[in-house]
Interface confidence: low
């Protein structure tokens, strides 16, 4: 059923031990109850118990309190299950009967075995709270409480919403008091069948089959499936869509494995030389003064260029070179002379001529001789 009307009998008082007719019970009124629950009637009248009926065993004699879940085969509270939307209104008839023997069937009892009969009607909402009531007649008093609650898996104001919590392939949810689904953490969707992927998992490129998972579609990788997978064999390149190979700066070719920037990647030029890329794996080094070689790896001797004049001898030094001038000459390269024509500086028949610019004289050499003093024989 979708719900149950519960009636809790608490106390019945029949101090004189008499029937409704006023006749006393012998030896006392062995009391049991019949309960009839039906649709709302402005005036409760006999007729079918449309919502159900229930009887108790003998619960006591004359006056007695009724224990919860009383023994003797009865149950307290009494249960009247129903299998329809609770209408919110009802009529209730409670009859107290005397049982002279053990047979409690209606046809086995004399009509005058009735002790008392009460009838109530009204509105009753579904809820956990008990409504306490007491009905008194001239001879008897009955104290009881009642309520309507939904059966397991039924919810809502009228017990009309069926909801069974589950955690399996068909859904992952519990039920709220109104019968709506409340998804377990990690699940979403109308029936909580759709897992919530790992936070940040890319909407298009990732998916999941269980919560907090992020599985990548082909061509994507990474914890959140937001990194594309480049072309297989891509060496120095990246991608913005799967299977691309966009070369990093300085690289070329289908797989970005051709070095277009040898200078930057390998720094081949030595001794402060300037490097210029000149094609794939090709470069040119421009050497600083004093260096030579493909990579400017060789140091030049500055004396190799014979910088000293007038027979001066050249000496290499850390910071360059130094000319040792013969007597009568001076200057960085022994280019200045302290002699004049009067000193007969020209050898091998050379004729001397006075000069004023820089040097004091100049020798004009005969054939087969050269040098500033005609001191060198030409072969």
């Amino acid at each position: 059923g979708s719900g149950v009307f519960q009636l809790q009998l608490q106390e019945f008082i029949n101090e004189r031990g008499v029937l409704a007719s006023g006749r006393p019970c012998e030896p006392g009124c062995r009391t049991f109850f019949r309960v009839c629950l039906k649709h709302f009637q402005a005036v409760v009248s006999p007729g079918p118990c449309t919502f159900g009926t229930v009887s108790t065993p003998v619960l006591g004699t004359n006056s007695f309190a009724v224990r919860d879940d009383s023994s003797g085969g009865g149950r307290n509270p009494l249960q009247l299950p129903f299998n329809f939307t609770w209408p919110g209104t009802f009529s209730l008839i409670i009859e107290a009967w005397h049982a002279p023997g053990d047979d409690l069937r209606p046809e086995a009892l004399p009509p005058d075995a009735l002790i008392s009969k009460i009838a109530i009607q009204g509105s009753l909402a579904v809820g956990q709270n008990w409504l306490l009531d007491e009905q008194t007649s001239t001879l008897t008093r009955l104290r009881y409480s009642y309520r309507v609650i939904c059966s397991d898996n039924y919810y809502g104001d009228n017990c009309s919403r069926l909801c069974k919590k589950r955690n399996d392939h068909f859904g992952h949810y519990v039920c709220q008091p109104d019968g709506n689904l409340s998804c377990l953490p990690g699940w979403t969707g109308e029936y909580c069948q759709q897992p919530i992927c790992l936070s940040g998992c890319h909407e298009q490129n990732g998916y999941c089959s269980k919560p907090a998972e992020c599985l990548c579609r082909p061509g994507w990788q990474g914890r959140l499936c937001n990194e594309c997978i480049p072309h297989n064999g891509c060496r120095h390149g990246t991608c913005s869509t799967p299977w691309q190979c966009t070369c990093d700066e300085g690289w070329g070719g289908l797989f970005c494995d051709q070095d277009l920037n040898y200078c930057t990647h390998h720094s081949p030029c030595k001794n402060g030389a300037t490097c210029s890329n000149s094609g794939q794996r090709s470069y040119t080094c421009t050497c600083r003064p004093g260096y030579t070689g493909v990579d400017c790896e060789l140091e030049l001797s500055e004396c190799d260029s014979n910088p000293c004049r007038n027979g001066g001898s050249c000496k290499d030094q850390e910071d360059g070179y130094h000319c040792l001038c013969p007597p009568g000459y001076y200057g960085l390269h022994c280019e200045h002379s302290t002699l004049s024509c009067a000193d007969s500086p020209c050898f091998n028949g050379g004729s001397c001529r006075e000069r004023n610019q820089g040097a004091n004289y100049a020798c004009e050499c005969p054939p087969n001789f050269t040098g500033s003093n005609c001191e060198k024989k030409v072969d």
Partner: antibody, heavy 118, light 107 residues
Framework: EVQLVESGGGLVQPGGSLRLSCAAS????????ISWVRQAPGKGLEWVGV????????DYADSVKGRFTISADTSKNTAYLQMNSLRAEDTAVYYC???????????WGQGTLVTVSS | DIQMTQSPSSLSASVGDRVTITCRAS??????VAWYQQKPGKAPKLLIY???FLYSGVPSRFSGSGSGTDFTLTISSLQPEDFATYYC?????????FGQGTKVEIK
């Protein structure tokens, strides 16, 4: 690092009450369910109940329904187990555990012993 | 409630042995089964979830299999640190229920 730390266990007389706490850290408290699982001395594991700290939804084992109440304080990242009408058979080590999305318990506290005896 | 029945309740084995523990559910639980390891005085540790998935950080010598009502936990080569009590658990329906445990002892 995910951590669950229980406290509040001790000796209590039958019919008495006790409140256990489970302090959680290292994960988003409101995104996970927290279960209580108990283990009587020398016995196996028994699920007690569960709470969704985000919504307050709870569920209980039949053996404790009506006596035990699970609650949570999301500002303190702490779950509680309020135990009333305690019986001798409630004597056990009580663990709180993170109830993973699939209903598995992937992180457990160290446990706290509750002894019900007169 | 769904009953989970483990067998054997205890076993003796040596280091290097292959060990198999079985668990039977009283009704179909699909693959909603987990396995735990517990050592004396300690909390249980999750080993396997969804019947066959190895939980992170758990050595690969542990494996799980099964679906429906019959499930198995296998330790391919028993190590000294594996001597403990093992529990199965179903999470197919509430309440989640555990097996009674299998104690693995040193032979």
């Amino acid at each position: 690092e995910v951590q669950l730390v229980e406290s509040g266990g001790g000796l209590v007389q039958p019919g008495g009450s006790l409140r256990l706490s489970c302090a959680a850290s290292g994960f988003t408290f409101t995104d996970n369910w927290i279960s209580w699982v108990r283990q009587a001395p020398g016995k196996g594991l028994e699920w007690v109940g569960v709470i969704n700290p985000n919504s307050g939804s709870t569920d209980y084992a039949d053996s404790v329904k009506g006596r035990f109440t699970i609650s949570a304080d999301t500002s303190k990242n702490t779950a509680y187990l309020q135990m009333n009408s305690l019986r001798a058979e409630d004597t056990a080590v009580y663990y709180c555990a993170r109830d993973n999305f699939g209903g598995y318990f992937d992180y457990w506290g160290q446990g706290t012993l509750v002894t019900v005896s007169s | 409630d769904i009953q989970m029945t483990q067998s054997p309740s205890s076993l003796s084995a040596s280091v290097g042995d292959r060990v198999t523990i079985t668990c039977r559910a009283s009704q179909d639980v699909s693959t909603a089964v987990a396995w735990y390891q517990q050592k004396p005085g300690k909390a249980p540790k999750l080993l396997i979830y969804s019947a066959s998935f190895l939980y992170s950080g758990v050595p690969s010598r542990f494996s799980g299999s099964g679906s429906g009502t019959d499930f198995t936990l296998t330790i391919s080569s028993l190590q000294p640190e594996d001597f403990a009590t093992y529990y199965c658990q179903q999470s197919y329906t509430t309440p989640p229920t555990f097996g009674q445990g299998t104690k693995v002892e040193i032979k």
